[in-house]
Interface confidence: low
Amino acid sequence: KSSSEATNITPKHNMKAFLDELKAENIKKFLHNFTQIPHLAGTEQNFQLAKQIQSQWKEFGLDSVELTHYDVLLSYPNKTHPNYISIINEDGNEIFNTSLFEPPPAGYENVSDIVPPFSAFSPQGMPEGDLVYVNYARTEDFFKLERDMKINCSGKIVIARYGKVFRGNKVKNAQLAGATGVILYSDPADYFAPGVKSYPDGWNLPGGGVQRGNILNLNGAGDPLTPGYPANEYAYRRGIAEAVGLPSIPVHPIGYYDAQKLLEKMGGSASPDSSWRGSLKVPYNVGPGFTGNFSTQKVKMHIHSTSEVTRIYNVIGTLRGAVEPDRYVILGGHRDSWVFGGIDPQSGAAVVHEIVRSFGTLKKEGWRPRRTILFASWDAEEFGLLGSTEWAEENSRLLQERGVAYINADSSIEGNYTLRVDCTPLMYSLVYNLTKELESPDEGFEGKSLYESWTKKSPSPEFSGMPRISKLGSGNDFEVFFQRLGIASGRARYTKNWETNKFSSYPLYHSVYETYELVEKFYDPMFKYHLTVAQVRGGMVFELANSVVLPFDCRDYAVVLRKYADKIYNISMKHPQEMKTYSVSFDSLFSAVKNFTEIASKFSERLRDFDKSNPILLRMMNDQLMFLERAFIDPLGLPDRPFYRHVIYAPSSHNKYAGESFPGIYDALFDIESKVDPSQAWGEVKRQISIATFTVQAAAETLSEVA
């Protein structure tokens, strides 16, 4: 049967009908509704929003909508003992204190439950000592400090600017350097775009604005107390001392007004070069400690936050498939926010809401997708991707057998310049084909396709006439699906111009100023970029759920595997003598990639030519496509990261947000020249090459003719 017959479809019930039903005005209305009060994970307000979304998804026409709850470790400031940082004089008197909260934006002064800025999961403590400025607190920044400048951070409080890498990596690096506390701040060089006013007059960060965020190093574990298993009523919970990924030193975030007061007194070594200097009128001295006149003054942190097991709620909606109800296409994004969530997450949640409404409209008219679509509103993403991870842990056996694809739907915008897509190579062709059919919302591209404006503004570094698609890293709810379970995944949003806007994230990220008005006044007044993102996300889900043959192209995986093999080989070749000494060869990996390429090519030919009307054959070919991503999973996981199991991709060990290719080999090679035992270190490189080789070859064989 054709897909039309199979899904009881009339000619009007096609992708075009679905896309035409999506309306910018609805997304705007939903965003406004979702952003009037804070929806912090674990609070009553966020539970009420979950129930509202459940009710509305039912009204929209989904077959079922359930709340699933888990009891996970969350972290909150102490309501009676505020967190702050002081400068103290030799008598121990506090001569300066940082702000206790962000000045609320106009119109929100009387909103209760605005959580003050804090670093979630910071332990309690009141360390005091000299300050050391550590730039972005990246691995390379600590190398510069410790190896080149001979500055010891042991026993010191470090101050690091936000940006470039995930904040949890900064804290981990500081801990390893022996710091007793970490102060994170937003430097105007990274969070204040030149020529733009501060909120509420523009989209820049004011001096009192502060970025909240968790500082965990979970490596995909989910709830810190129940790694690997759902945090349900019968779960065994670890003690807090054995919890996964918790920081061991106090951490607190501040804005640049307060940072100025701390940094202006810094003495000690000068900054090594201009890449260590931000935009404040301070010397950016590294320290340790304050300069001459102030040398007896110290910095003291006062952190009183508490971690507590708290109930969270996901909303899971189901639209049952007509032909393959046991094949799941998942669209998920989180609902919890730090404060109002004007961009993160509600610009994404509003888009999901409109996608559900459009699918529901088609369903009410008698249509069903070929495969089951699951819609998810995740809780506690901001506290470590907890809602999505616990649900996936609870349903892992179903997901690994039935999961076709996961499309993520956090913030729809981080700018309004062009499209940004990160996805598995299996989805490249789907994304290219879809964006060729969609209209560009960009000025100057009226009547042109989204593909065309995207390619012009964000060209591929490798292939002329094609747009850039990036690797999946982490820091969002696709992590468990892709990195742990091996379900093909993708994400799309509108982004900034990375050439001209060098700041990290958008300036008001995770601050109280991330409001509905920020979006409506400055980012997307017509909600046309939101609509485009809805069309991309929704269109991907539609195709994945409704195409007779899954819209995956395994040949694109072959291309990237060759690119990644070349890249890791070139990194290793920086050590030619050691490679010779320890007999390190990449020949086997290149051979496996060649085999994969040939088998993928033959599979694609068979896919093109087989009888699509034969349901057994169709299911067999689709299963080979569905399970290809799964074939890259190593059940043993990566070294010291058991929940990162994908051999081709993992979040970078130095920046959770970034994706790394052949991560096992990459990590084995990283800083190998400093290893105490080179024989053991190069032995580990060889072991990782063999694992990668086996995995690529095994994945190739899943595409071979079945008999």
């Epitope: 009676t80 003992h81 505020p82 002081s86 506090e94 204190n97 206790l100 209760s112 439950d113 605005i114």
Partner: nanobody, 116 residues
């Protein structure tokens, strides 16, 4: 039960001073940070000042910095707001509020009118 009672408001000329008090009862006063908040006629609420549970940390909105001083006497369960160099735009109902986030208990307010 938990109660906050403000006093000390009145009519005063620009440039003069007033001292507001807030008597707290029904809870352990020295465990809680406290706020002063104001509402000008026809306007929304505006944070004025905040003080930590032990009085060591204070924070002021920009428009009152250098003119207003928040303080507390934990032995008397009382919060104060010393207002100097008053301006016409300081005219408002002033409320004290318990707790930092959220402010879960409010007083009934005391009116300050600054007029020549």
């Amino acid at each position: 039960q938990v109660q906050l009672v403000e006093s000390g408001g009145g009519v005063v000329q620009p440039g003069r001073s007033l001292r507001l008090s807030c008597a707290a009862s029904g809870f352990t006063f020295n465990n809680y940070g406290m706020h002063w908040v104001r509402q000008a006629p026809g306007k929304g609420l505006e944070w004025v000042a905040i003080i930590s549970y032990d009085g060591n940390t204070k924070y002021y909105t920009d428009s009152v910095k250098g003119r207003f001083t928040i303080s507390r006497d934990n032995s008397k369960n009382t919060l104060y707001l010393q207002m100097n160099s008053l301006r016409v735009e300081d005219t408002a109902v002033y409320y004290c509020a318990k707790g930092l986030w959220p402010s879960d208990v409010w007083g009934q307010g005391t009116t300050v009118t600054v007029s020549s």
